[in-house]
């Protein structure tokens, strides 16, 4: 199963270590994450062609997943630390419905499924922590989120394969931007 | 279930027109993004034209664009291909699909859960 920040065999035998920072138990968790996304998307590009022909086998896309834009103060200009932040939080927790979807998604990789998962989890709570202004956060509608599972489970088998490979994509540019700007605060 | 029955098809000469219909017995037709596609004996189906839900946005394979144009009328049940300046290769078995996605809009036909029976054109040159 894979092992989670901060638990790896290296911590373990180095107990004098400083203990990270903040921001790098952040940076860490991201990269984390990053990695096991990697590995769902080998399985799913493996199992399918759905990863190269996307483009032309789909004429809209309608799956509403959090994307970065000049407006949330995440990119180099305009970057607004504030703004930014409440951002990645909230696309994080927009992340989840999707996130819980890719579960039963694997066959090989159920755990790294459910690891991204609960990585996620706790990434969300660090950056929580972090934020000065959470009142700006939107949750998502738990009732929303439960019709909007139903629906994505009742898709048909090639509908799905390519839902998970479009969550799987756009979770993946989601947090490389995240981590692009959480290293400019 | 849905049931999708086609009509329209025919023989035309080149030049000439063809407006095919897809009927659906679906109670929720609506949330269904339909589309059509065409065979001809010994190749693939091959995609030739979608619509979304709404029918806001249609889209069709680069050999039917610009005499093509795939519509939809929600309060009918019906999807419909309007086709003009018909060319010989155009001759093939017309099928309606309909996908119950909700999300996506296929342009292949795996993305599809329910297909017509097929109506045949031919275009004589």
């Known amino acids: 199963a894979p092992v989670p920040p901060g638990e790896d065999s290296k911590d373990v035998a180095a107990p004098h270590r400083q203990p990270l920072t903040s921001s790098e138990r952040i940076d860490k968790q991201i990269r984390y994450i990053l990695d096991g996304i990697s590995a769902l998307r080998k399985e799913t590009c493996n199992k399918s062609n759905m990863c190269e022909s996307s483009k032309e086998a789909l004429a809209e896309n309608n799956l509403n997943l959090p994307k970065m834009a000049e407006k949330d103060g995440c990119f180099q200009s305009g970057f607004n630390e504030e703004t930014c932040l409440v951002k990645i939080i909230t696309g994080l927790l927009e992340f989840e419905v999707y996130l819980e979807y890719l579960q039963n998604r694997f066959e090989s990789s159920e755990e790294q499924a459910r690891a991204v998962q609960m990585s996620t989890k706790v990434l969300i709570q660090f950056l929580q922590k972090k934020a000065k202004n959470l009142d700006a956060i939107t949750t998502p509608d738990p009732t929303t989120n439960a019709s909007l599972l139903t629906k994505l489970q009742a898709q048909n088998q090639w509908l799905q394969d390519m839902t998970t490979h479009l969550i799987l994509r756009s979770f993946k540019e989601f947090l490389q931007s995240s981590l692009r700007a959480l290293r400019q605060m | 279930q849905v049931q999708l029955v086609e009509s329209g098809g025919g023989l035309v000469q080149a030049g000439g027109s063809l407006r095919l219909s897809c009927a659906s017995s679906?109670?929720?037709?609506?949330?269904?993004?339909m589309g059509w596609f065409r065979q001809t004996p010994g190749k693939e189906r091959e995609f030739v034209s979608t619509i979304n839900w709404s029918g806001s946005n249609g889209y069709y394979a680069d050999s039917v664009k610009g005499r093509f144009t795939i519509s939809r009328d929600n309060a009918k049940n019906t999807v419909y291909l309007q086709m003009n300046n018909l060319k010989p290769e155009d001759t093939a078995v017309y099928y309606c699909?309909?996908?119950?996605?909700?999300?996506?809009?296929?342009?292949?036909?795996?993305?599809?859960?329910?297909w017509g029976q097929g109506t045949q054109v031919t275009v004589s040159s």
């Open positions: 679906g109670r929720t037709f609506s949330s269904y993004v």
């Open positions: 699909a309909a996908s119950a996605g909700g999300f996506l809009v296929p342009r292949v036909g795996q993305g599809y859960d329910y």
